[in-house]
């Protein structure tokens, strides 16, 4: 799977679109040890998938999963 | 090449069990979500249940709920689909398929024939 | 659950032909919609996901577009092997996925 990550560096990233609705949560891979700058994604399924960071589909889906994250539950 | 071969169909009576496999080849089974999607005779297509690549999630369709258990052994890089108190309404080709994580379905099994008479 | 809706249920075209169906979502499904085709006795095969990216090893005579809730899914010139049925499916809703009730390309 492009983007799939065994470890905790990416070092291929998806090119394709993500639903904002199968996503679940993020985070950033910013490690020194890390060539790449990377966005993991874990969808609803569980799996964690590689983005790069500077696209803006990538941008627009953390902000929405932040925006989600912070919306308190009834 | 990817390939999901089906058994376990056949024709059942109506509150008995069946239980469908999918052995998967060609592919990392064990990283990927799978789907178990059903046509009725001359309809169109009907969502059943899905599982994550490491079976710690499963959801289903409302109309097998609570009677339907779809699991999988990665070691042996099979999908199964437990079907209890089966129904008339349940007759069908049965598709194994797998999540592509982009919203979509695909591969697709060859399809097993599931059908509840008396 | 989102209901998607196809039309035409049945269409009759003859080779050559440029063949577009239609898909609407009951809300809202952003780009998130695939095409499928199925000939009888076999399994569905993916065509077009996210609206209108084409699949790996699918011929460029089929395209998809569209967002929110209206899609097309066109054939540009028919071929003998595209008479078959076709299904869109939406993923905006997950777990709940749905598919349409399908179209049935005929030969005329």
């Known amino acids: 799977h492009p983007g799939s990550i065994p470890t905790s560096c990416c070092f291929i990233m998806t090119s394709k679109k993500i639903p904002n609705t199968l996503l679940k949560s993020y985070k950033r891979i910013t490690n020194n040890r890390c060539t790449l700058k990377a966005i993991v994604f874990k969808t609803r399924l569980g799996k964690e998938i590689c983005a790069d960071p500077k696209k803006k589909w990538v941008q627009d889906a953390t902000k929405h999963l932040d925006q989600k994250l912070q919306t308190p539950k009834p | 090449q990817v390939q999901l071969v089906q058994s376990g169909g056949g024709v059942v009576q109506p509150g008995r069990s069946l239980r469908l496999s999918c052995a998967a080849s060609g592919f990392t089974f064990s990283s990927y979500g799978m789907h178990w999607v059903r046509q009725a005779p001359g309809k169109g297509l009907e969502w059943v249940a899905v599982i994550s690549y490491d079976g710690s999630i499963k959801h289903y369709a409302d109309s097998v709920k609570g009677r339907f258990t779809i699991s999988r052994d990665n070691s042996k890089n099979t999908l199964y689909l437990q079907m209890n108190s089966l129904r008339t309404d349940d007759t069908a080709v049965y598709y194994c398929?797998?999540?592509?994580?982009?919203?979509?379905?695909?591969?697709w099994g060859q399809g097993t024939m599931v059908t509840v008479s008396s | 659950d989102i209901q998607m809706t196809q039309s035409p249920s049945s269409v009759s075209a003859s080779v050559g032909d440029r063949v577009t169906i239609t898909c609407r979502a009951s809300q809202d499904i952003s780009s998130w919609l695939a095409w499928y085709q199925q000939k009888p006795g076999k399994a569905p095969k993916l065509l077009i996901y996210a609206a209108s990216s084409l699949q790996s090893g699918v011929p460029s005579r089929f395209s998809g577009s569209g967002s929110g809730t209206d899609f097309t899914l066109t054939i540009s010139s028919l071929q003998p092997e595209d008479f078959a049925t076709y299904y869109c499916q939406q993923a905006s809703s997950f777990p709940s996925i749905t598919f349409g009730q399908g179209t049935r390309l005929e030969i005329k």
């Open positions: 398929a797998g999540d592509t994580d982009y919203g979509d379905i695909d591969p």
